[in-house]
């Protein structure tokens, strides 16, 4: 299984989308875990709703949010307020009983904003003033179902 490398800027959000065969994994909850060492166990960070039929609802653990679009076959994980300590190897998993099938391996890299680096030395400043617009990249975005639940009549 290939490892996908995703980079995010510290302090911003990084969105990860893991795709899967919708019918093969129908009825299975999904999880996002962090691998401890190259051959170590994968420590669960967050998993989708305990009742599978509500898997499309966002589930949060700390700054990590997960939601599953079971029809499209896409589970989306959002790492909010990315910190240097969030860097590492993760897995998207499909849960069946006590077994976990790896859907995707993801290497998260956190990029530091050079303007926040107090030891950066002298900063070069252009003579003419210029505006700088930082572009925030959302990796593999997917639409989450807009819903108020319980259903409205």
């Amino acid at each position: 299984l290939n490892t996908t490398v995703l980079q995010g800027m510290a302090g911003q959000s990084l969105r990860v989308s893991c795709t899967y065969d919708a019918l093969k994994h129908w009825g299975r909850r999904k999880a996002w875990c962090r691998q401890l060492g190259e051959e170590g166990p994968c420590q669960r960070v967050v998993s989708t709703h305990g009742v599978w039929l509500l898997a499309f609802l966002k589930k949060r653990n700390g700054s990590t949010v997960i939601a599953d679009d079971t029809l499209a076959g896409t589970v989306t994980i959002t790492l909010k307020n990315l910190q240097a300590g969030d860097a590492g190897l993760y897995q998207c998993q499909s849960l069946r009983g006590r077994e976990a099938e790896v859907l995707q391996k993801v290497l998260v890299e956190v990029l530091e904003d050079p303007l926040d680096d107090q030891d950066a030395g002298d900063l070069w400043v252009p003579e003419e003033s210029s505006s700088f617009e930082g572009a925030q990249v959302e990796h593999s975005t997917s639409r989450n179902q807009e819903t108020s639940f319980p259903p409205t009549s």
């Epitope: 919708a22 019918l23 129908w26 009825g27 009742v51 599978w52 039929l53 509500l54 898997a55 499309f56 599953d68 679009d69 079971t70 029809l71 499209a72 076959g73 639409r143 179902q145 807009e146 819903t147 259903p151 009549s153």
Partner: antibody
């Protein structure tokens, strides 16, 4: 208020075709999975087909696979079911239903009757 | 395909009495089960999801219970508007399937 209004039903001969429509209002149509569920006269409910909010994913019951096609026009807030090679056993009231990606049917239309008979 | 079996097929109850409807799945569906109500000439209406959670606007006299393969829908005190056909639906196995229904009629 969520409203789903089916149309297009009627009498058709075996082997014929029919196109059902479902006009939706009262919610953000493009954000929801939509399904067709049918009910033969005096019988129970049978799920027929589903389409994701974007229209990118479609699935069918084995009984209609290859004959029916589900589609949607999000700009018109309308769901469709193109039914070809119709058989007598397709005779039923066809409901369109707004649901979740896990096929929980939150809201239903009033249904449209399709009769396949010679 | 998961087979959902509902019993009894018909239940005769007097207004004000309790009605207990059963639904059995051929395999465990955990709590991924829904109940729908259908009155004559009308579309079905979602009553219960997650085996026990009432949908918005559903009166408290309706309650669902069970997990795995055995489920129950209880109507604590039948009102005239509750006489209808009730269907259960399993969701976690493809394709989603419904039970054959239980008709609750006036005794």
């Amino acid at each position: 208020e969520v409203q789903l209004l089916e149309s297009g039903g009627g009498l058709v001969q075996p082997g014929g075709s029919l196109r059902l429509s479902c006009a939706a209002s009262g919610f953000t149509f493009s954000s929801y999975a939509m399904s067709w569920v049918r009910q033969a006269p005096g019988k129970g409910l049978e799920w027929v087909s589903v389409i994701s909010g974007s229209g990118g994913s479609t699935y069918y019951a084995d009984s209609v696979k290859g004959r029916f096609t589900i589609s949607r026009d999000n700009s018109k807030n309308t769901l469709y079911l193109q039914m070809n090679s119709l058989r007598a056993e397709d005779t039923a009231v066809y409901y369109c239903a707004k649901g979740t990606p896990t096929l929980l049917f939150q809201h239903w239309g009033q249904g449209t009757l399709v009769t396949v008979s010679s | 395909e998961i087979v959902m079996t509902q019993s009894p097929a018909t239940l005769s109850v007097s207004p004000g009495e309790r009605a207990t409807l059963s639904c059995r799945a051929s395999q465990s569906v955990s709590s991924n089960l829904a109940w729908y109500q259908q009155k004559p000439g009308q579309a079905p209406r979602l009553l219960i999801y997650g085996a026990s959670t009432r949908a918005t606007g559903i009166p408290a006299r309706f309650s669902g219970s069970g997990s795995g393969t055995e489920f129950t829908l209880t109507i604590s005190s039948l009102q005239s508007e509750d006489f209808a056909v009730y269907y259960c639906q399993q969701l976690p196995y493809w394709p989603p399937t419904f039970g054959g229904g239980t008709k609750v009629e006036i005794k």
